[in-house]
Amino acid sequence: LQDLCSNCPAGTFCDNNRSQICSPCPPNSFSSAGGQRTCDICRQCKGVFKTRKECSSTSNAECDCISGYHCLGAECSMCEQDCKQGQELTKKGCKDCCFGTFNDQKRGICRPWTNCSLDGKSVLVNGTKERDVVCGPSPADLSPGASSATPPAPAREPGHSPQ
């Protein structure tokens, strides 16, 4: 006996109760390949999940995470909390970066500020919880009498504020 089920296209299932007739998948179910004997239940995107793509008779729904969360795992199986810049996600929730560390993203861990002195440079702009330090010229370049590619700024008269 030829297996008539192999003729059933995606979006249908082979109904053994009805002489192997190809029946459409019931509402909220799908079959993504032909020859299926059952249709799979559509994924529901609720709670912290939101629908990115609706379920159809031939493909499952696809979920995303609502604002304040980001996807983890295959096909966004999990939603992980976002933190603010200047924080990191710990096992007990979002916590501020410790002094000397920063995070400029909504996810990931706090990283140490760059150590400018390791490159023989000085700190031009101090670091914060949200931003790394900015390294500038080496301290030697800033010392009096050091040669510079740019001419020195003209001296201001006492009592005058900069323009």
Partner: nanobody, 124 residues
Framework: EVQLLESGGGLVQPGGSLRLSCTAS????????MSWVRQAPEKGLEWVSS????????FYADSVKGRFTISRDNSKNTLYLQMNRLTAEDTAVYYC?????????????????WGQGTTVTVSS
Amino acid sequence: EVQLLESGGGLVQPGGSLRLSCTASGFTFSNYAMSWVRQAPEKGLEWVSSISGSGGSTFYADSVKGRFTISRDNSKNTLYLQMNRLTAEDTAVYYCAKEGSNGTDDYHYDIDVWGQGTTVTVSS
């Protein structure tokens, strides 16, 4: 390939118990701390418990302390979570997770591999 496979989930009545298992493969199990993390139907991920590579150090979220016990059998490459006095608030998908190093604590969130999850439903 690193794989984590959870089992033991199911439907249980309030006040009941369940024991989850997680079988690991593809890495030297005893070299890494392991965690259980859960996601309730309407919520984001919530860390539940962690255990060091040797099993000598364990940590728990306040919400499960005194009710849940994490353990491991390194000879069987298996992680366990014994859950007692279950309540409706424990209803979630429970994920087994590998941490990035041998040691662990109740602060640093250092997970690099996740299992597929097993569903625990607490209902009368």
